[in-house]
Interface confidence: low
């Protein structure tokens, strides 16, 4: 009779992440009578998948009936199967032997691939706020998924981006991959409300795309623009003069009033109004009495904004001019050097 | 182009210690079960240990058990092997060795590094 | 442990020749039987594993078969560069263990 062979006629097997994996193995024998046993990888550091004989494997049912005394089908189902599974499975016939079975013939082997789906991609932006015109970094992650063909797009507000580099990792064989990308994004003053897309493609996904997204509200800072002005009087002695912040975002605002280097007040933005654009305006006055100073009066608008170096705008305040309202572009003057540090 | 390349060898006064280092190159270390083999000098091949791909399992010849130590860094690709307490019978050159199949044990050793010389001698 | 017996321990042949070398275990190791290629003051090279199944770049005239504790390694046509010495290796248990070794010379 000619001798039993261990036959795995499947060399390959693609199964889904969480699906169940069968791995067909057939004897072309009865004899010797022995155990099957089937095993992950070769070698004396194999893995034991299954054990005919002797175990308890709560992921393995086999798919025909081992108990039977003509059965030569050793096939087996692994259940709820995830890419650590991935590995070449041999189903290897024991010879019954004393004290120990001894390995009598192994099948080719039948090599377990996995697919499993990228996880949601997740977006992040840079740890500091930028303001306008500069450009930041974002980065997108996927990890788990198999094979290693994948697709990723970037998007700001629904336009594709061309400046990103992109790595799959590991380069070589593994049972599950990750990517991992950077985009170049250059912010404008518009963009409080717009939101950077990354977008990930994969075989698993059947054309349903996956996307992480990230709102460059969280990354952008726009600086106030500062506008000082005296308005009409309001008693025989009294000025009033208006500081006005206009498009600024985040909303974190303190804004210190100045007569002439002294500080007079200090108050945080707190009913702001809110433009298209998503930036704020505010505005805080002053009420000066002109009657308490003998000389010109220099009041002075600090704002300090988001944690940045404070940016000022000055009025002049004539005592012994008639108190009537003066336009501020004549007397308002600029801290430039303070607005240098903020832009 | 894979790439095994041992270092370390040297000679060494009997009951003294060394540290083979095997640097790996051009494949994906992290995937491969490694093996330390050594051959005396016109003799024949002796396997030492070997290790999983994660360093889980290690697993020794008798002649290397409580005396030699493999382990791996796959940060660094880098297999290692710890020979303390060395004696005469310890020369030879000491080749580090890929297993072939990846996620598996220690099976078939493909490639090979091109040895280095450990002289125990007094 | 499982022993690995070679046999010849040399052989002389010519080129063009055919050479045939055995193996024995000491017992069964059904095919995980690996062969491989030592040339003097290099690293053994694998040619066979699994007991016939031909490594990637290895010349067709190498064939291995076998299976349990028998197992052969043939060279159908001696190649000047086949001048060598061969060694069988089992995979199957842990202590893994070579052969001693069979020397290929030219008669």
């Known amino acids: 009779e000619e001798e039993l062979q261990v036959i795995q006629p499947d060399k390959s097997v693609l199964v889904a992440a969480g699906e169940t994996a069968t791995l067909r193995c057939t004897a072309t024998s009865l004899i010797p009578v022995g155990p099957i046993q089937w095993f992950r990888g070769a070698g004396p550091g194999r893995e034991l998948i299954y054990n005919q004989k002797e175990g308890h494997f709560p992921r393995v049912t086999t798919v025909s009936d081992l108990t039977k005394r003509n059965n030569m089908d050793f096939s087996i189902r692994i259940g709820n199967i995830t890419p650590a599974d991935a590995g070449t499975y041999y189903c290897v016939k024991f010879r019954k032997g004393s004290p120990d079975d001894v390995e009598f013939k192994s099948g080719a082997g039948t090599e377990l691939s996995v697919r499993a789906k990228p996880s949601a991609p997740v977006v992040s932006g840079p740890a500091a706020r930028a303001t306008p015109q500069h450009t930041v970094s974002f980065t997108c992650e996927s990890h788990g998924f198999s094979p290693r063909d994948i697709t990723l797009k970037w998007f700001k507000n629904g336009n594709e981006l061309s400046d990103f580099q992109t790595n799959v990792d590991p380069v070589g064989e593994s049972v599950s991959y990750s990517i991992h990308s950077t985009a170049k994004v250059v912010l404008t003053r518009e963009d409080v409300h717009s939101q950077v897309i990354c977008e990930v493609a994969h075989v698993t996904l059947q054309g349903d795309p996956l996307r992480g997204t990230a709102n460059l509200s969280e990354t952008i800072r726009v600086p106030p623009t500062l506008e000082v002005t005296q308005q009409p009087v309001r008693a025989e002695n009294q000025v009033n003069v208006t500081c006005q912040v206009r498009k600024f975002y985040p909303q974190r605002l303190q804004l210190t009033w100045l007569e002439n280097g002294n500080v007079s007040r200090t108050e945080t933005a707190s009913t702001v109004t809110e433009n298209k654009d998503g930036t704020y305006n505010w505005m805080s006055w002053l009420l000066v009495n002109v009657s308490a100073h003998r000389d010109d009066v220099k009041l002075t608008c600090q704002v300090e904004h988001d944690g940045q170096p404070a940016v000022s705008k000055s009025h002049d305040l004539k005592v012994s001019a008639h108190p009537k309202e003066q336009g501020s572009n004549t007397a308002a003057e600029n801290t430039g050097s303070n607005e240098r540090n903020i832009y | 182009e894979v790439q095994l390349v041992e270092s370390g060898g040297g000679v060494v006064q009997p009951g003294r210690s060394l540290r083979l280092s095997c640097a790996a190159s051009?494949?994906?270390?992290?995937?491969?079960?490694m093996s330390w083999v050594r051959q005396a000098p016109g003799k024949g091949l002796e396997w030492v240990a070997s290790?999983?791909?994660?360093?889980?399992?290690?697993y020794y010849a008798d002649s290397a058990k409580g005396r030699f130590t493999i382990s791996r860094d796959n940060s660094k690709n880098t297999l290692y092997l710890q020979m303390n307490s060395l004696r005469a019978e310890d020369t030879a050159v000491y080749y580090c060795?890929?297993?072939?199949?990846?996620?598996?044990?220690?099976?078939?050793?493909?490639?090979w590094g091109q040895g280095t010389l450990v002289t125990v001698s007094s | 442990d499982i022993q690995m017996t070679q046999s010849p321990s040399s052989v002389s042949a010519s080129v063009g020749d055919r050479v045939t070398i055995t193996c024995r275990a000491s017992?069964?190791?059904?095919?995980?039987l690996a062969w491989y290629q030592q040339k003097p003051g290099k690293a053994p090279k694998l040619l066979i594993y699994?007991?016939?199944s031909l490594q990637s770049g290895v010349p067709s005239r190498f064939s291995g078969s076998g299976s349990g504790t028998d197992f052969t390694l043939t060279i159908s046509s001696l190649q000047p560069e086949d001048f060598a010495t061969y060694y069988c290796q089992q995979a199957i248990y842990f202590p893994i263990t070579f052969g001693g070794g069979t020397k290929v010379e030219i008669k």
């Open positions: 060795a890929e297993g072939k199949e990846t996620y598996s044990g220690p099976n078939w050793f493909d490639p």
């Open positions: 699994a007991a016939s």
């Open positions: 017992q069964g190791i059904s095919s995980w």
């Open positions: 290790i999983w791909v994660d360093g889980s399992n290690k």
């Open positions: 051009g494949f994906t270390f992290s995937y491969y079960g």
